[in-house]
């Protein structure tokens, strides 16, 4: 799903207040709901009729440093006989998410939000038919 | 997928530098890759064999203010005849994502990262059989 453009109004102070100095804001340390955890059914990536693999990307100057991307294993979907059914399609499910980018020059450290497109998994769909002229 | 605990080391300055004052950091305004967009196949939530509905939650003090959650429509999956096949299961695909929480008291505005669990869509799986003693 889409993250709307900031328009930078979210990060601005109320109009009656002095503006934010130097185009930066105060970000408190710590993460709210940090202990919240995904509780998905186990191994759904291999049990799915539209199975997928995971690739991990790592960047020490990004939080979270590890971002996991899914890739659908097949064009078709797996039928009850364990064979690929090409009349159906495995398609990626994508999500826009935020990460924090760390930028430092010597002892001056600043952070900036970054939008990342994550493929979370795959689902099996009936393909849309387009008649080509 | 899981976001690891911060351990707050990511947000700390190098050891040789003076510590961050007042437990906060500098967050630059603006979002990197803000124009990046999801390019999923259209209406996959209704074309999927494990279809889902969307619910939108809205919070003006969160960025993004709009967070969309998916809910699987069925316990089973939809077969080629358009009927629910209860021998297979529709299961949610979840993703941990970051949002920014805005906190203000008068003209003092600060921000904090918050972890949110998002159900992005559903996939059709073979259920795991557990033999109960």
């Amino acid at each position: 799903r889409k993250i709307p453009k900031v328009g930078h109004t979210f990060f601005q102070k109320p109009e009656s207040c002095p503006p934010v100095p130097g185009g930066s804001m105060k970000l408190d340390i710590g993460i709210i709901n940090e202990n919240q955890r995904v509780s998905m059914s186990r191994n759904i990536e291999s049990r799915s009729t539209s199975p997928w693999n995971y690739t991990v990307t790592w960047d020490p100057n990004r939080y979270p440093s590890e971002v996991v991307q899914a890739q659908c294993r097949n064009l078709g979907c797996i039928n009850a006989q364990g064979k690929e059914d090409i009349s159906m399609n495995s398609v990626p499910i994508q999500q826009e998410t935020l990460v924090v980018r760390r930028k430092h020059q010597g002892c001056s450290v600043s952070f900036q939000l970054e939008k990342v497109l994550v493929t979370v998994g795959c689902t099996c769909v009936t393909p849309v038919i387009h008649h080509v002229q | 997928r899981k976001i690891p605990k911060v351990g707050h080391t990511f947000f700390q300055k190098p050891e040789s530098c003076p510590p961050v004052p007042g437990g906060s950091m500098k967050l630059d305004i603006g979002i990197i890759n803000e124009n990046q967009r999801v390019s999923m196949s259209r209406n996959i939530e209704s074309r999927s064999t494990s279809p889902w509905n969307y619910t939108v939650t809205w919070d003006p003090n969160r960025y993004p203010s709009e967070v969309v959650q998916a809910q699987c429509r069925n316990l089973g999956c939809i077969n080629a005849q358009g009927k629910e096949d209860i021998s297979m299961n529709s299961v949610p695909i979840q993703q941990e994502t970051l949002v920014v929480r805005r906190k203000h008291q008068g003209c003092s505005v600060s921000f904090q990262l918050e972890k949110v669990l998002v159900t992005v869509g559903c996939t059709c799986v073979t259920p795991v059989i557990h033999h109960v003693q």
Epitope: C72, L75, V125, P127, I129 | I44
Partner: nanobody, 116 residues
């Protein structure tokens, strides 16, 4: 935008052979396939044969296995359907298709008639 150009349909006697060809141009992803569906008016469209564009895996309907062969020339994204030992029940409009995940592009079709 995907373009499909089909050729090779016609009239043939039972037991005869025909070769259909189709070339695809436009945006083609690595996870895609090309192939043929067929349809008899008033009946449901049937997948005949498909070939994966990168893996080269092939898929055939049970009714054509051992008689039809799908092949592909990578360089110009052209596929061929060699149809041998044709039967009257193979009479249909054959549609070239290009399948991107979630989207199936279908050509205008070429008529194959098998007379007994």
């Amino acid at each position: 935008q995907v373009q499909l150009v089909e050729s090779g349909g016609g009239l043939v006697r039972t037991g005869g052979s025909l070769r259909l060809s189709c070339s695809v141009s436009g945006d083609i992803s690595s996870q895609s396939a090309m192939g043929w569906y067929r349809q008899v008016p008033g009946r449901q469209r049937e997948l005949v044969a498909m070939i994966h564009t990168t893996k080269g895996d092939t898929y055939y309907a049970d009714s054509v296995k051992g008689r039809f062969t799908i092949s592909r020339i990578n360089a110009n994204n052209t596929i061929y359907l060699q149809m041998n030992n044709l039967k009257p029940e193979d009479t249909a409009i054959y549609y070239c298709t290009h399948n991107e995940p979630g989207d199936l592009y279908m050509g205008q079709g070429t008529l194959v008639t098998v007379s007994s």
